[in-house]
């Protein structure tokens, strides 16, 4: 069985999620990469992806999501700026490698966004809200269309564990029904 781990991030509205997904440099440097959300009982949904082939350290922006693929470091950097409560959920990075199925990168990200104080008051109109306005100068890449080859399975359950320290991991064992999403060009 596949052992999946999650890292939990608890942030406030208006803050930035800034994470990395490591990949094997020689194997995947120029492969197209994507940032997906996994909602319970649904297929993973691609929110943003790099260009094809993926360009080195070339920012790709889709709405509030910014992807940067650092080929020389073997990592995909994902930033979600000006977070909203609705952004809460389980996320993952994948590598598109047609005609093969996408390759999932570890670890998954459990994002919890709450209202309230995020360094600067967010709800008070008289105060300065920590909302970063992104200049629309980056590239918006088109992500491949995909479909599930079989019935949608239940996504990993939301953790009820108390994850209070940054080092905490949620270990999901016996997850054999990971959704594989082949790419159709």
């Amino acid at each position: 069985a596949t052992k999946l781990t999650e890292e939990k991030y608890e942030l406030k509205e208006g803050q930035t999620l800034d994470v990395k997904c490591d990949y094997t440099l020689e194997k995947f440097a120029s492969s197209q990469k994507a940032w997906q959300i996994i909602r319970d009982g649904e297929m993973p949904k691609t929110l943003a992806c790099t260009e094809r082939p993926s360009k080195n350290s070339h920012p790709v922006q889709v709405g509030r999501i910014i992807l940067e693929d650092y080929h020389d470091h073997g990592l995909l950097r994902v930033r979600m700026v000006n977070l909203q409560v609705e952004d809460s959920g389980l996320y993952q990075c994948v590598i598109y490698q047609p005609p093969k199925e996408p390759h999932m990168l570890f670890d998954r990200i459990r994002l919890v966004v709450t209202k309230g104080f995020s360094g600067t008051p967010g709800s008070n109109e008289n105060s300065t809200q920590n909302v970063y306005k992104i200049p629309p100068t980056t590239t918006k890449a088109l992500c491949p269309l995909y479909t599930s080859p079989r019935t949608v399975t239940q996504a990993p359950p939301k953790s009820t564990a108390d994850v209070s320290t940054p080092d905490s991991e949620i270990n999901l064992t016996n997850v054999t029904d990971i959704i594989r999403v082949p790419v159709f060009n």
Epitope: E7, Y9, D18, D107, N130
Partner: antibody, heavy 121, light 105 residues
Framework: QVQLVQSGAEVKKPGASVKVSCKAS????????IHWVRQAPGQGLEWMGW????????NYAQKFQGRVTMTRDTSISTAYMELSRLRSDDTAVYYC??????????????WGQGTLVTVSS | SYELTQPPSVSVSPGQTASITCSGD??????VSWYQQKPGQSPVLVIY???KRPSGIPERFSGSKSGNTATLTISGTQAMDEADYYC????????FGGGTKLTVL
Amino acid sequence: QVQLVQSGAEVKKPGASVKVSCKASGYTFNGYYIHWVRQAPGQGLEWMGWLNPNSGGANYAQKFQGRVTMTRDTSISTAYMELSRLRSDDTAVYYCARDQRKTTVTPFEYWGQGTLVTVSS
Amino acid sequence: SYELTQPPSVSVSPGQTASITCSGDKLGERQVSWYQQKPGQSPVLVIYQDNKRPSGIPERFSGSKSGNTATLTISGTQAMDEADYYCQAWDRNVVFGGGTKLTVL
């Protein structure tokens, strides 16, 4: 608990090389980046680069490109930083530090005790 | 190359509030960390993700960010808080601010 233990102080002559070690314990060594940061006497913190222990890949600050090499020996959970062509202004305390999480590059939650490298003729 | 700017020094009386700023281009879309360093010691993480405190860090330490400026605030400053403080962010590489010497008068 997580610990990073560094090798002892070194005295080197200009033009020589130095190799500092950082032994990790209390966690899975492969899972977290190791960074190297130096601090010259009376100066601030200067990031030198990171090492991905899983792949062995490294990323160096531009200032040190061509002079620094970061490696690891996973069998003994130890990271190394070698700096060559030493100059007197390389005299500094050299720290190794570990990422807080697997999925981030910063912050550095755990630090070694530091290794003083003195470059003098 | 990316730079983070801090004031070289800040002075505060015991019991008062000390504020140390850190500014940088596009800091609004980056997460900021703060470190405390006392003479002869390794740095200690005091704030991460703009405003979170690691366990063991006193509640008097707090962080905030507005636009492209991050602020470390120490309320009810104590003599033991006298140290150098560094901000940090990740651009393409990891960057530290120049450091601020906090003096408790």
